[in-house]
Interface confidence: medium
């Protein structure tokens, strides 16, 4: 069964800066990745970035840089100040659409006990939805 993992890290140098890394553990070809915060995409969450293998990357503030790390994983750097700034308990979600598996989504947030610059290892997060 395909899985999605999500890792959230707060940068030690900039406390309002977060790095989100997501990956897809499956054999299919990824056709779209959507990163959102505040909940799953389409269920109250706000889209931060969309990554498409052909059409490229779209990102919205406070996303600063979204990129493919491998053909099946992505990273997103967020920076914010004021109302648009993420906070320590913000939930980030990644949805991977792939062929032939369909869509798989998982969410994660900063580990409660983590110090800036530290993070939990990128273990698979619970799968919230598989379309």
């Amino acid at each position: 069964t395909p899985e999605v993992w999500v890792q959230v890290r707060m940068e030690a140098t900039e406390l309002s800066s977060f790095t989100i890394r997501c990956g897809f553990l499956g054999s299919g070809s990824i056709s779209l990745v959507t990163v959102s915060w505040g909940g799953p995409n389409g269920a109250g969450g706000t889209t931060l970035a969309v990554l498409h293998p052909e059409r490229g990357i779209r990102q919205w503030a406070p996303a600063r840089q979204a990129r493919w790390e491998t053909q099946s994983s992505i990273s997103l750097i967020l920076e914010g100040s004021g109302a648009s700034s993420p906070c320590a308990n913000t939930t980030f979600c990644c949805k991977f659409a792939s062929f032939p598996e369909g869509s798989w989504e998982a969410c994660g947030s900063l580990p409660p006990s983590s110090d800036p610059g530290l993070s939990a290892p990128p273990t698979p997060a619970p799968i919230l939805r598989a379309d």
Partner: antibody
Framework: EVQLVESGGGLVQPGRSLRLSCTAS????????MSWFRQAPGKGLEWVGF??????????EYTASVKGRFTISRDGSKSIAYLQMNSLKTEDTAVYYC?????????????WGQGTTVTVSS | DIQMTQSPSSLSASVGDRVTITCRAS??????LNWYQQKPGKAPKLLIY???SLQSGVPSRFSGSGSGTDFTLTISSLQPEDFATYYC????????FGGGTKVEIK
């Protein structure tokens, strides 16, 4: 040999329509997105639009200035990409190029046609 | 849309010269930048993709570097066939190009 050949250009009056064709050979047409570009006389390159590969559902996207007037389509059985241009304006005068790609957007457009000239004038 | 600013708009150089062209994006585009060469009356030709990867068949005197917002195309030793116009292009739709740099004979 991998090749793209455009056709269909010519002189057309403002407000009229024209359809350009881009005939592909030497590669598996359905595996690639196809893009259209244009270059006005003495100017730089401008992206016109894009149609995704068969795998990605053939999605289309256009530059703002042609949205609603131009339509890109593809015929996999003939290995042809089309650019249907309606409500043409004098500022659409340019050499139009089709290009293969991107197969993955980071790869760029690696094969281009020779271009076809469209002149919009009364 | 992401704006691409290329400089210089033109330059004069001699055969054997090292030539550097720069391109700046209005926001970070990671390494998703391509470079093209175009000669008068001809279609563009892909030289460099993903900022620094040399397209197959392109001479090794061409190289690209940069990441984020600032990028460079370098021709290590200019050859007679290199006199042309060069364009940078960012890779996410809507695709946008720099204004071009015309490399002329000094």
């Amino acid at each position: 040999e991998v090749q793209l050949v455009e056709s269909g250009g010519g002189l057309v009056q403002p407000g009229r329509s024209l359809r350009l064709s881009c005939t592909a050979s030497g590669f598996t047409f359905g595996d690639y997105a196809m893009s259209w570009f244009r270059q006005a006389p003495g100017k730089g390159l401008e992206w016109v639009g894009f149609i995704g590969s068969k795998f990605y559902g053939g999605e289309t996207e256009y530059t703002a200035s042609v949205k609603g007037r131009f339509t890109i389509s593809r015929d996999g059985s003939k290995s042809i990409a089309y650019l249907q241009m309606n409500s043409l304006k004098t500022e659409d005068t340019a050499v139009y190029y089709c290009a293969r790609g991107p197969r993955r957007y980071t790869y760029g457009m690696d094969v281009w046609g020779q271009g076809t000239t469209v002149t919009v004038s009364s | 849309d992401i704006q691409m600013t290329q400089s210089p708009s033109s330059l004069s150089a001699s055969v054997g010269d090292r030539v550097t062209i720069t391109c700046r994006a209005s926001q970070s585009i990671s390494s998703y930048l391509n470079w093209y060469q175009q000669k008068p009356g001809k279609a563009p030709k892909l030289l460099i993709y993903a900022a620094s990867s040399l397209q197959s068949g392109v001479p090794s005197r061409f190289s690209g570097s940069g990441s984020g917002t600032d990028f460079t195309l370098t021709i290590s030793s200019l050859q007679p066939e290199d006199f042309a116009t060069y364009y940078c292009q960012q890779s996410s739709t809507p695709l946008t190009f720099g204004g071009g740099t015309k490399v002329e004979i000094k």
